[in-house]
Interface confidence: medium
């Protein structure tokens, strides 16, 4: 029986470890600066890295600019979006800006998009200053179903900071759905 | 066999509980206001509390102003940095400020520092207002290896809010590395 | 013994799953826009949804405007608070605003309230712009005991954005207390 107990313990340790790893999808996606849309209108950002630098993904899928959930669960979602402008890169179309981020969820079954989180600020970026910068951070805990898609919309995409430490979003699974 | 099963369950419960606790390092470090650098330049903040008020640490180490990882894993890192100025404390060197935070990772093996997250804003803190305040929050999910060090750099350290609810950073382990 | 091992594995799988779910309380509460206080003073926000739209709660209690902890543990707490003003809704009492959030913890045993996290900004919302917006995000990792209560205080509650994606707070348990 001692040998059997050891085997039970051993198999359980494997099972527990394996199931724990399988049960914890995550993603941290960083902006792909080679393909940032221009303009000042609100757009969905579709170009993100998932496998270079700080970017990584496991048990989730990145496709067509969207982060796709593969496993039902409660997830913590977050986004950090940085905007910047230097006078050498041209005058702003307007000094009054609305710098915003929207984290949206799309369900394929019901083809509609819903905003989970939003953040941002109106800013007056006067020409009297050579450099302007502003960052937004949002985060929250949401129930996500397999097949649902998370995407990021921003205003003024041409002002995005292209650094991987500046503009990113991500998710990690915290627990199963009861 | 019933007794054996109970023993298996019992030992497993202990093992599961113990391994779960051991597998989840965390830290929440609050600013040590007695030792905030002066000036407006970018500096690394080295004085943090780890064992008073809201500050706490477990299975991580705080040394030489850095949060040291003791256990490989994926961690959620966060920082909240508050800046403030009251006219009674004197005029600002300049009304145009760049209030920034950088969360950096240093690897001892490769003695170089990389910024994981940044946030902040340029601000115009005019003399027309007696009080100014601004907070930055950043957070993200990162792979950290044992021995790696997390530190916080800020601009304008003399403007930091010294309250424990205002200026802090932390980390908690979410999952193992596959 | 093989049957016994299968039974051990089976019962353990149930126990592990059950204990894992029971061990992970969470809440995501969204602002109840029908009952936002007026004025510009600092107030405690007591009206939140816990069971509609993105709002949800499990193994925690929402009562009298406070999120009550039912289970000791280390929790990640977060809040996202959005303020907005449109010129059509009338002039602001003052163009110089202090837009703040305070996440507080109250212990019933020691009837006192302590601020865990704060964030915000002073803003100059000039009449030259028709629309103003600003969001605050805070988050941190805290030890909470059963019976302790989490609440949200803000300045200028009349300026709160009533959308569920804009003004919310939440918590999820990360680990037990050793």
């Amino acid at each position: 029986i001692r040998a059997e107990k050891a085997m039970v313990d051993g198999s359980w340790l494997d099972l527990a470890k394996r199931s724990k790893l399988e049960a914890q999808p995550f993603a941290h996606l960083t902006i792909n600066a080679t393909d940032i849309p221009s303009g000042s209108h609100k757009v969905s950002l579709s170009s993100w890295y998932h496998d270079r630098g700080w970017a990584k993904i496991s048990n989730m899928t990145f496709s067509n600019g969207k982060l796709i959930v593969n496993q039902d669960g409660f997830y913590y979602l977050y986004a950090n979006i940085c905007f910047r402008h230097h006078e050498t890169s041209g005058d702003l179309a307007t000094e009054y800006l609305q710098l915003m981020v929207y984290v949206t969820k799309t369900s394929i079954k019901i083809p509609s998009s819903h905003t989970l989180m939003k953040g941002g600020s109106t800013k007056y970026w006067s020409g009297n200053s050579e450099f302007h910068f502003y960052s937004i951070n949002v985060g929250g805990f949401f129930k996500l179903r397999s097949g649902e898609e998370i995407s990021i919309e921003v205003s003024n995409p041409s002002l995005l900071d292209p650094d991987q430490d500046a503009t990113y979003f991500g998710a990690f699974k915290v627990r199963d759905i009861d | 066999i019933r007794a054996e099963k109970a023993m298996v369950d019992g030992s497993w419960l202990d093992l599961a509980k113990r391994s779960k606790l051991e597998a989840q390092p965390f830290a929440h470090l609050t600013i040590n206001a007695t030792d905030i650098p002066s000036g407006s330049h970018k500096v690394s903040l080295s004085s943090w509390y780890h064992d008073r008020g809201w500050a706490k640490i477990s299975n991580m180490t705080f040394s030489n102003g850095k949060l040291i990882v003791n256990q490989d894993g994926f961690y959620y890192l966060y920082a909240n940095i508050c800046f403030r100025h009251h006219e009674t404390s004197g005029d600002l060197a300049t009304e145009y400020l760049q209030l920034m935070v950088y969360v950096t990772k240093t690897s001892i093996k490769i003695p170089s520092s990389h910024t994981l997250m940044k946030g902040g804003s340029t601000k115009y803190w005019s003399g027309n207002s007696e009080f100014h305040f601004y907070s930055i929050n950043v957070g993200g999910f990162f792979k950290l290896r044992s021995g790696e060090e997390i530190s916080i750099e800020v601009s304008n350290p003399s403007l930091l809010d010294p309250d424990q609810d205002a200026t802090y950073f932390g980390a908690f382990k979410v999952r193992d590395i596959d | 013994i093989r049957a016994e091992k299968a039974m051990v594995d089976g019962s353990w799988l149930d126990l592990a799953k059950r204990s894992k779910l029971e061990a992970q309380p969470f809440a995501h509460l969204t602002i109840n826009a029908t009952d936002i206080p007026s004025g510009s003073h600092k107030v405690s926000l007591s009206s939140w949804y816990h069971d509609r739209g993105w709002a949800k709660i499990s193994n925690m209690t929402f009562s009298n405007g406070k999120l009550i902890v039912n289970q000791d543990g280390f929790y990640y707490l977060y809040a996202n608070i959005c303020f907005r003003h449109h010129e059509t809704s009338g002039d602001l009492a003052t163009e110089y605003l202090q837009l703040m959030v305070y996440v507080t913890k109250t212990s019933i045993k020691i009837p006192s309230s302590h601020t865990l996290m704060k964030g915000g900004s002073t803003k100059y919302w000039s009449g030259n712009s028709e629309f103003h917006f600003y969001s605050i995000n805070v988050g941190g990792f805290f030890k909470l005991r059963s019976g302790e209560e989490i609440s949200i205080e803000v300045s200028n509650p009349s300026l709160l954005d009533p959308d569920q994606d804009a003004t919310y707070f939440g918590a999820f348990k990360v680990r037990d207390i050793d």
């Epitope: 006078e87 050498t88 890169s89 005058d91 702003l92 179309a93 006067s126 020409g127 009297n128 050579e130 | - | -």
Partner: nanobody, 122 residues
């Protein structure tokens, strides 16, 4: 109608100085980045110096340390003080007001003057 009128050009010996001036009418120069460009016959028009709204100054490498750009928003003028002139500074100098885009890119500028000739003899 927007008009930018340059003046102050002429013939000068190497090592000498000139001061170019640009008077703006029909636009408020204080709301624009104001710059100087120059062009040799048969060559592309190239950036010389700029002063954005912030009051900072930007210079092309060949003129840095010798030329100084300044603006007087009250008078709606932008000047270029040119010292230690060299024969290779010979060109037609144009005043320009930027609409949008990079300071250094001539395509960013919506309004141009007719130009003033600067000749530096050795």
């Amino acid at each position: 109608e927007v008009q930018l009128v340059e003046s102050g050009g002429g013939l000068v010996q190497a090592g000498g100085s000139l001061r170019l001036s640009c008077a703006a009418s029909g636009l408020t120069s204080s709301r624009y980045t104001m710059s100087w460009f120059r062009q040799d016959p048969g060559k592309e028009r190239e950036f010389v110096a700029a002063v954005p709204l912030s009051g900072n100054t930007y210079y092309a490498d060949p003129v840095r340390g010798r030329f100084t750009i300044s603006r007087d928003n009250a008078k709606n003028t932008v000047d270029l003080q040119m010292n230690s002139l060299k024969p290779e500074d010979t060109a037609v100098y144009y005043c320009a007001a930027r609409a949008s885009g990079s300071i250094f890119n001539r395509g960013s500028y919506a309004y141009w003057g007719q130009g003033t000739q600067v000749t530096v003899s050795s």
